[in-house]
């Protein structure tokens, strides 16, 4: 077949951008191409070529006629993660081929178990009390928060800190007294920690 | 097609080695880890251990260390078993299968037959 | 090692049937369970992922359901062609329970 004067190479005109994604929700990385004739786009991740449904109908992922990937869900385990990994597009025609910008898919996880549950504390009036816990194992890391008696601590009582895993309170109240409970949020969810007792004895 | 196709029957003599191949297709092989289970005649099913084909690594049940061996070879999307020091109680049916990422094996190979026998 | 207690170890049932059989982890192992089925002279097949999620392909007659410790396999009604051997298995450690023989009564 001979050249066209109206052909030419491929060209991306929409490069995939890095993504962060739950696991089991659908995720798109973005990939469009110009050329004539009308590239053609294949996926790679980490240099070995990406299944779609165009090779196995019942792959979770699917090359849309944009070009783009789609997965229907993201898949990750315990040990197998075959969606996580660097993404190029590359599209072809008979006059060449063009690659996109690398694009990192992760996978956002929660972890069920805390790593450390808070323990009772017992203090009395006056005193200081802390509790601390550290949250399960997550990307993104988890924000810590605290609830007491079920509903949000109100960390703008300047008698309460709260960093990293600990929750501090600078002098305690009989009113402090109550069931806590340490929370692990990230865009997975959150995760609740087991109860903690702050008991506060009168002097 | 996804599927693991598995290297035909062998017939070894006690203290010999055996190596078992698992040619997989149809996915991308790096993403997901291989296991091998074995199944003795008339017996239950047996995890031997896994090996993760991106990287190499690899873990064994303490019954298996320092007897088994599993490696792989990428550039034709191959597992490998190999187990050593045959005894006649290693006879049994030896399988390779894929751990999908919802932790679980969704892809098994036909099984090959291992004969242990003076 | 986590332990995989399967009961009952062999079952008769005839068609029709609801048939349940039990799993049972020497600790907690969350909803890290997963079933499978297997015929004479053929591979393992998955049925149940993740406790109670049915693998693509497999009958709604089969339905898992547990978490922690006590997990089931439900066939609801038995048909001629799940007459086979069913293993539990736990994805933490990854070791399978002992089995149960499902024969025809």
């Known amino acids: 077949s001979r050249l066209r004067q109206e052909d030419f190479p491929p060209r991306i005109v929409e490069h995939p951008s890095d993504l962060i994604v739950s696991k089991g929700e659908p995720a798109t990385l973005n990939c469009k191409a110009e050329g004539r004739p009308t590239p053609t786009i294949e996926w790679y991740k980490g240099g070995e070529r990406v299944e779609t449904d165009k090779d196995d109908p019942r792959s979770h992922r699917m090359l849309l006629p944009s070009g783009s990937l789609f997965f229907l869900r993201i898949v990750h385990g315990r040990r197998s993660k075959p969606d996580e990994g660097v993404y190029v597009c590359v599209a072809r025609n008979y006059l060449g081929e063009a690659v996109s910008h690398n694009a990192s898919l992760e996978v956002a996880i929660l972890r069920d178990d805390f790593r450390q549950n808070p323990s009772d504390v017992m203090v009395a009036v006056g005193e200081p009390a802390v509790m601390e816990c550290q949250p399960p194992r997550g990307h993104p890391e988890p924000t810590i928060s605290w609830k007491k008696d079920g509903s949000p601590l109100d960390d703008k009582d300047e008698r309460i800190t709260i960093r990293g895993g600990k929750l501090m309170i600078t002098y305690t109240r009989k009113s402090d007294a109550g069931k806590y409970v340490c929370v692990g949020t990230n865009m997975v969810g959150e995760r609740e920690s087991e109860v903690a007792e702050l008991t506060v004895l009168e002097r | 097609e996804v599927q693991l196709v598995q290297s035909g029957a062998e017939v070894k003599k006690p203290g010999a080695s055996v190596k078992v191949s698992c040619k997989a297709s149809g996915y991308t092989f790096t993403g997901y880890y291989m296991h091998w289970v074995r199944q003795a005649p008339g017996q239950g099913l047996e995890w031997m251990g896994w090996?993760?084909?991106?990287?190499?690594?690899?873990e064994f049940p303490q019954k298996f260390q320092g007897r088994v061996t599993m490696t792989r070879d990428t550039s034709i999307t191959t597992a490998y078993m190999d187990l050593s020091r045959l005894r006649s109680d290693d006879t049994a049916v030896y399988y390779c299968?894929?751990?999908?990422?919802?932790?679980?094996?969704?892809?098994w190979g036909q099984g090959t037959m291992v004969t242990v026998s003076s | 090692d986590i332990v995989m207690t399967q009961s009952p170890s062999s079952l008769s049932a005839s068609v029709g049937d609801r048939v349940t059989i039990t799993c049972r982890a020497s600790?907690?192992?969350?909803?890290?369970l997963n079933w499978y089925q297997q015929k004479p002279g053929k591979a393992p097949k998955l049925l149940i992922y993740a406790a109670s999620s049915l693998q693509s392909g497999v009958p709604s007659r089969f339905s898992g359901s547990g978490s922690g410790t006590d997990f089931t396999l439900t066939i609801s009604s038995l048909q001629p062609e799940d007459f086979a051997t069913y293993y539990c298995q736990q994805s933490v450690g990854l070791f399978f329970g002992g089995g149960t023989k499902v024969e025809i009564k």
């Open positions: 600790q907690s192992i969350s909803s890290y």
């Open positions: 299968a894929r751990e999908s990422g919802d932790d679980a094996f969704d892809i």
């Open positions: 090996i993760n084909p991106k990287n190499g690594d690899t």
